[in-house]
C-alpha cells in the first residue's frame, strides 16, 4: 500500500533571467527512493538515480544545475519556461509518486517573492 505523500512548492513565480529551485519532498513512507525524474510537460529535464547519480538532458545542460539534494535549479529563465513541472519519485517497494509544480516566469521586475524555494 502506498502511504507516502509528495510535498511541492505548488505555484511559484520568478523573474525572467533569474533562477529558481524546484523541490519536492516525499514523506510518510519508509520506501527507498531509487530514482527521481524531473519533467517539464512531456520533456525530460533530469534524472537522479541512487546508483548512477545525475543525468541532465543535453538540451538543458547549460542552464540546469542539479540540487540541492534531489531538487533541480533552473537558471537564465525565459518566459518559455512558464508551465508545469513534475517530480516523479520511483520507490521500492511502494512504486511511483508524482508531484506537480507550476512555474510562471514574469517579464516584469515585480515577480512575487513568496516562493518558498526562490533564490535571487
Amino acid at each position: 500500500m502506498m502511504t507516502g505523500t509528495i510535498e511541492t512548492t505548488g505555484n511559484i513565480s520568478a523573474e525572467k533571467g533569474g533562477s529558481i529551485i524546484l523541490q519536492c519532498h516525499l514523506s510518510s513512507t519508509t520506501a527507498q527512493v531509487t530514482q527521481v525524474n524531473w519533467e517539464q510537460q512531456d520533456q525530460l529535464l533530469a534524472i537522479c538515480n541512487a546508483d548512477l547519480g545525475w543525468h541532465i538532458s543535453p538540451s538543458f545542460k547549460d542552464r540546469v544545475a542539479p540540487g540541492p539534494g534531489l531538487g533541480l535549479t533552473l537558471q537564465s529563465l525565459t518566459v518559455n519556461d512558464t508551465g508545469e513541472y513534475f517530480c516523479i519519485y520511483h520507490t521500492y517497494p511502494d512504486g511511483t509518486y508524482t508531484g506537480r509544480i507550476f512555474l510562471e516566469v514574469l517579464e516584469s521586475s515585480v515577480a512575487e517573492h513568496g516562493a518558498r524555494f526562490q533564490i535571487p
Epitope: E7, I21, H25, L26, S27, T30, V33, V36, C48, N49, A50, L52, G53, W54, H55, I56, K61, D62, V64, A65, P66, G67, P68, G69, L70, T73, F117
Partner: antibody, heavy 117, light 107 residues
Framework: EFQLQQSGTVLARPGASVKMFCKAS????????MHWVKQRPGQGLEWIGA????????NYNQKFKGKAKLTAVTSASTAYMELNSLTNEDSAVYYC??????????WGQGASVTVSS | DIVLTQSPATLSVTPRNSVSLSCRAS??????LHWYQQKSHGSPRLLIK???QSISGIPSRFSGSGSGTDFTLSINSVETEDFGMYFC?????????FGGGTKLEIN
C-alpha cells in the same frame, strides 16, 4: 570499486597558496557533485563548497568565497581545490566527497594542510 | 544559513545498551537530513540518508527518524566498533551545513 584519492600532506608558509587534488575512479565523474569539507584538529566538519563536473556549476559557503576555488578536469576525473592567502586558520584536514543527490556516499582519505612560518 | 545543533556533545554508553542522538535544525529542512559516522583518524562514512533510508553495508542497528526540524539517530545495542563521532548534515538548501557532532564514547 569507487575511490577518491587525495593529495598528500602539505606544509605551506603564511600568505602562500596550495592546490590539492581529488582523483575519482570507478564511477562516472560528471554525474556527481564533488564536495570539499574542512576539519580542524579536534573539531567538526565544515562545508566549503561543491563543484558539478557535468556543467561546471559551483556552490560555495559564503565564508570560503575568495579563499577557496573549486575546479575540475573531467578528462582526468580529477577535482581540485585551491586555497589562497593561507593563515594558521587554514591548517586542517580537507576531505573531498561525492554526492549524487542521496548523501555524500564516498569520501577521500583527507589531505592535511599545515600552515607554519 | 541553516544551523544544525546536535546534542548531547558527548554521550557515554556501555556496549549493548541503546542510544539516541539528536539533531535540531534552525528551520524546517523537511526530510533532507543525513547522518555520518567518523572514527578516530578516519574519513566520515554515510550511515543514513534522507532521515531514515538505509545505506548498503551499514548494520541494521542504525536507524533514523524525524522530520521538519527535529531528527534522531538511534543505535540499537551499541557495539564497540560504534564509538566515535556522529554528524548530521542537511541538503535542503545551499549552503549545505553540518551539525557540530556528538561524540559517542565508552562508559
Amino acid at each position: 570499486e569507487f575511490q577518491l584519492q587525495q593529495s598528500g600532506t602539505v606544509l605551506a608558509r603564511p600568505g602562500a597558496s596550495v592546490k590539492m587534488f581529488c582523483k575519482a575512479s570507478g564511477y562516472s565523474f560528471t554525474r556527481y557533485w564533488m564536495h570539499w569539507v574542512k576539519q580542524r584538529p579536534g573539531q567538526g566538519l565544515e562545508w566549503i563548497g561543491a563543484f558539478y563536473p557535468g556543467n561546471s556549476a559551483t556552490n560555495y559557503n559564503q565564508k570560503f568565497k575568495g579563499k577557496a576555488k573549486l575546479t575540475a578536469v573531467t578528462s582526468a576525473s580529477t577535482a581540485y581545490m585551491e586555497l589562497n592567502s593561507l593563515t594558521n586558520e587554514d591548517s586542517a584536514v580537507y576531505y573531498c566527497s561525492r554526492e549524487g543527490g542521496y548523501g555524500m556516499d564516498h569520501w577521500g582519505q583527507g589531505a592535511s594542510v599545515t600552515v607554519s612560518s | 544559513d541553516i544551523v544544525l545543533t546536535q546534542s548531547p556533545a558527548t554521550l557515554s554508553v556501555t556496549p549493548r545498551n541503546s542510544v539516541s542522538l539528536s539533531c535540531r535544525a534552525s528551520q524546517s529542512i523537511r526530510n533532507n537530513l543525513h547522518w555520518y559516522q567518523q572514527k578516530s583518524h578516519g574519513s566520515p562514512r554515510l550511515l543514513i540518508k534522507y532521515v531514515s533510508q538505509s545505506i548498503s553495508g551499514i548494520p541494521s542497528r542504525f536507524s533514523g527518524s524525524g522530520s521538519g526540524t527535529d531528527f534522531t539517530l538511534s543505535i540499537n545495542s551499541v557495539e564497540t566498533e560504534d564509538f566515535g563521532m556522529y554528524f548530521c548534515q542537511q541538503s535542503n538548501s545551499w549552503p549545505y551545513t553540518f551539525g557540530g557532532g556528538t561524540k559517542l564514547e565508552i562508559n
